[in-house]
């Protein structure tokens, strides 16, 4: 499975969307887990509602929220108030009994906000410029290329 690399700013929210075939995964709960080491187990962070028809309702564990649109085949995970310690390798999983099928591997990278490290007074923005062209203004970004991890 290819690994998707997602970047988010520290202190902000990062939204992850994992898509799957709604029919193949019919009736299955979804989970978000954190990979402990390259070959280690995947530690469950949060899973969708125990009643499958209610999977669209948000379930929270700490600063991580999960919700599943089981008809469209999209499970969405939101990592709120992103911290440096949240960086790492995660998995979206589809649960069937005691088995877990990996839907997607996600590498989360946390970017430090450059404003935190400098005096805002040192920054100068031309009056006529309403935005930084090409600057990163999204709360989260996804690299277009997919990086493969073993």
């Amino acid at each position: 499975l290819n690994t998707t690399v997602l970047q988010g700013m520290a202190g902000q929210s990062l939204r992850v969307s994992c898509t799957y075939d709604a029919l193949k995964h019919w009736g299955r709960r979804k989970a978000w887990c954190r990979q402990l080491g390259e070959e280690g187990p995947c530690q469950r962070v949060v899973s969708t509602h125990g009643v499958w028809l209610l999977a669209f309702l948000k379930k929270r564990n700490g600063s991580t929220v999960i919700a599943d649109d089981t008809l469209a085949g999209t499970v969405t995970i939101t990592l709120k108030n992103l911290q440096a310690g949240d960086a790492g390798l995660y998995q979206c999983q589809s649960l069937r009994g005691r088995e877990a099928e990996v839907l997607q591997k996600v590498l989360v990278e946390v970017l430090e906000d450059p404003l935190d490290d400098q005096d805002a007074g040192d920054l100068w923005v031309p009056e006529e410029s309403s935005s930084f062209e090409g600057a990163q203004v999204e709360h989260s970004t996804s690299r277009n290329q997919e990086t493969s991890f073993p």
Epitope: A22, L23, K24, W26, F56
Partner: antibody, heavy 119, light 107 residues
Framework: QVQLVQSGAEVKKPGASVKVSCKAS????????MSWVRQAPGQGLEWMGV????????VYAQKFQGRVTMTRDTSISTAYMELSRLRSEDTAVYYC????????????WGQGTLVTVSS | DIQMTQSPSSLSASVGDRVTITCRAS??????LAWYQQKPGKAPKLLIY???SLQSGVPSRFSGSGSGTDFTLTISSLQPEDFATYYC?????????FGQGTKVEIK
């Protein structure tokens, strides 16, 4: 026992809309997804879409996108399917069918509603 | 969309016969296949799901097998009430699709 009772036959003119109802009994309406399948005279079965009765979320077959609307009223355990801009090819028997969570197969079906589109 | 092809499209058989209907998927659907029986003027009735699981209340003379792209519905000993049209349905890839049907007639 589980029952899905559909509204009666309809005759519509091309361009009109039709709304078919499906009243569920004998089980918890919000515990199962509801789908709609149609069958033209002498033809096979064609899946139209599905609704989650709790959230109201829907997914429609591409062929019917923009023409079909599936809704529900949980207070009376009833699902609805509305098809607009009818044409003669929409003449068919329309079935509601319940989907259990253990498999995407249709375990109980309504008796069917014949919709005839004719000028 | 996945195409489901049933064969034969119709067959004639006698009471007590062993009847086999096949269904082929245009791509691998694992074991995500269901079989239905439909009698004239009636709604379809679920017989088999997940290729081989018998739906509650369905007689044990009905059985299903297969995986991947090729599937079979077998009626071990045809009964008078079994004369009907049979449909397969794949439920492994969106959207779900049906075969064109196999009509089982009295010889």
């Amino acid at each position: 026992q589980v029952q899905l009772v559909q509204s009666g036959a309809e005759v519509k003119k091309p361009g009109a809309s039709v709304k078919v109802s499906c009243k569920a009994s004998g089980y918890t309406f919000t515990g199962y997804h509801m789908s709609w399948v149609r069958q033209a005279p002498g033809q096979g079965l064609e899946w139209m879409g599905v609704i989650n009765p709790v959230s109201g979320n829907t997914v429609y077959a591409q062929k019917f996108q923009g023409r079909v609307t599936m809704t529900r009223d949980t207070s009376i355990s009833t699902a609805y399917m509305e098809l607009s801009r009818l044409r003669s090819e929409d003449t068919a028997v329309y079935y509601c069918a319940r989907i259990p969570s253990y498999t995407y197969a249709f375990d109980y079906w309504g008796q069917g509603t014949l919709v005839t589109v004719s000028s | 969309d996945i195409q489901m092809t049933q064969s034969p499209s119709s067959l004639s058989a006698s009471v007590g016969d062993r009847v086999t209907i096949t269904c082929r998927a245009s791509q691998d659907i694992s074991n995500y296949l269901a079989w239905y029986q439909q009698k004239p003027g009636k709604a379809p009735k679920l017989l088999i799901y997940r290729a081989s699981s018998l739906q509650s209340g369905v007689p044990s003379r009905f059985s299903g097998s297969g995986s991947g792209t090729d599937f079979t519905l077998t009626i071990s000993s045809l009964q008078p009430e079994d004369f009907a049209t049979y449909y397969c349905q794949q439920h492994g890839h969106s959207p779900t699709t049906f075969g064109q049907g196999t009509k089982v007639e009295i010889k």
